[in-house]
């Protein structure tokens, strides 16, 4: 079901929000040995006109914001998405119960922007 | 005023939508000489569980989708954003009325994904 903000004017500008994810909460505790969880973070907030420098907006996002202003029924605002992501190392059991240490890319949000 | 999706279950999956932008429509015709417009396109659609291969989802987006499923009030779904952008060349007048040819990066959406 949809989980929407009913009053977009009450939403803050696009930014990084802190979020710790426990692998037990995800139900992954039987195959992930370590870590027990990690600071994944997430991006959320409005990408509204005018897009300021903090919003790391692309040229396309600037154009899209203007098109949305004039045609909100047809073109959405740009969305608030990660612009910088980091990897984490995970120790886990593979399908054959071998213990593997692997680096998983793009797991941690370091910065957000309007895209 | 708010602009919300009332029926996100009826929204299509994250994908690229075609959009031609005329510089006259943006009110930029007095300083952009050529082109008259360009195929900017945009991304829109749902990033819902399960994220399939077409959605070019990052590892973080996969994790965020699961966290959203369990905590929809606190963590949004990942958003549908450009994954590949192209440049366009623009001929325009600068502030001193000189004619400039410049390549503007990240102007055209070539592909979308869940981020």
């Amino acid at each position: 079901s949809a989980s929407d903000y009913n009053s977009s004017e009450l939403k803050t500008a696009c930014r990084k929000h802190e979020l710790y994810v426990s692998f037990q909460d995800l139900g992954w505790q039987d195959w992930i040995i370590a870590p027990k969880g990690y600071a994944a973070n997430y991006c959320d907030g409005e990408c509204s006109f005018p897009l300021n420098a903090h919003m790391n907006a692309t040229n396309h996002a600037i154009v899209q914001t203007l098109v949305h202003l004039m045609n909100p029924e047809y073109v959405p605002k740009p969305c608030c998405a990660p612009t910088k992501l980091n990897a984490i190392s995970v120790l886990y059991f593979d399908d054959n119960s071998n213990v593997i240490l692997k680096k998983y890319r793009n797991m941690v949000v370091r910065a957000c922007g309007c895209h | 005023s708010a602009s919300d999706y009332n029926s996100s279950e009826l929204k299509t999956a994250c994908r690229k939508h075609e959009l031609y932008v005329s510089f006259q429509d943006l009110g930029w015709q007095d300083w952009i000489i050529a082109p008259k417009g360009y195929a900017a396109n945009y991304c829109d659609g749902e990033c819902s569980f399960p994220l399939n291969a077409h959605m070019n989802a990052t590892n973080h987006a996969i994790v965020q989708t699961l966290v959203h499923l369990m905590n929809p009030e606190y963590v949004p779904k990942p958003c549908c954003a450009p994954t590949k952008l192209n440049a366009i060349s623009v001929l325009y007048f600068d502030d001193n009325s000189n004619v400039i040819l410049k390549k503007y990066r990240n102007m055209v959406v070539r592909a979308c994904g869940c981020h």
Epitope: M70, Y74 | D4, K11, T12
Partner: antibody
Framework: QVQLVQSGAEVKKPGASVKVSCKAS????????LHWVRQAPGQRLEWMGW????????EYAQKFQDRVTISRDISAITVYMELSSLRSEDTAVYYC???????????WGQGTLVTVSS | EIVLTQSPDTLSLSPGETASFSCRAG???????LAWYQRRPGQAPRLLIY???NRVTGIPDRFSGSGSGTDFTLTINRLEPEDFAVYYC?????????FGQGTKVEIK
């Protein structure tokens, strides 16, 4: 040809709700947005809100935000505007109108008179 | 919100004459996103002009629009009996869409 046909006139008591329908034909319903505009006696035309018939996205004018709901039924190619907590000032002719990207309202319904009276 | 003010409120003219009336915006309308509508008694508004000066297909060429920025004009040359109606301007460059209060063109 494009046609928007609205439901008939309504008389309502203060505090009640009214639901006006707008049936579309002659174009691809889900590709366009439909707006609602009203005109009270002696007043200017007043925009109330819109719905995109394809994805169900809506936006409402701040003035009506708490009282109006715009919905659609794709199978019936019909859009609805429901206004609640009616008061005498809501007596007006209500119109649905289609809008295309970058353009104004190109086709309008014939209008529905809603009278609010005790 | 862009406030539109039309003048005059009423114009009394005879068939064959030229009607000209104005629509002034409270702030600049970028890209001339201004439309003109005609409304005859008991009918829905009918789009005449968009983009301040572009005539809709099927609208007679006696109707013309002009202007930019904050000042716009609708001119009707050689008034026909069916042109006596109320004319509204509208800003359509995004939410909220706003209308002028209307100019009534009546038979003198």
């Amino acid at each position: 040809q494009v046609q928007l046909v609205q439901s008939g006139a309504e008389v309502k008591k203060p505090g009640a709700s009214v639901k006006v329908s707008c049936k579309a034909s002659g174009y691809s319903f889900t590709n366009y947005a439909l707006h609602w505009v009203r005109q009270a006696p002696g007043q200017r035309l007043e925009w109330m809100g819109w719905i995109h018939a394809g994805n169900g996205k809506t936006e409402y004018a701040q003035k009506f935000q708490d009282r109006v709901t715009i919905s659609r039924d794709i199978s019936a190619i019909t859009v609805y505007m429901e206004l609640s907590s009616l008061r005498s000032e809501d007596t007006a002719v209500y119109y649905c109108a289609r809008r295309q990207l970058w353009l104004p309202f190109d086709y309008w319904g014939q209008g529905t008179l809603v009278t609010v009276s005790s | 919100e862009i406030v539109l003010t039309q003048s005059p409120d009423t114009l009394s003219l005879s068939p064959g004459e030229t009607a000209s009336f104005s629509c002034r915006a409270g702030q600049i309308i970028i890209n001339r996103q201004l439309a003109w509508y005609q409304r005859r008694p008991g009918q829905a508004p009918r789009l005449l002009i968009y983009g301040a000066s572009n005539r809709v297909t099927g609208i007679p060429d006696r109707f013309s629009g002009s202007g930019s920025g904050t000042d716009f004009t609708l001119t009707i040359n050689r008034l026909e009996p069916e042109d006596f109606a109320v004319y509204y301007c509208q800003h359509y460059g995004g939410s909220p869409w706003t209308f002028g209060q209307g100019t009534k063109v009546e038979i003198k």
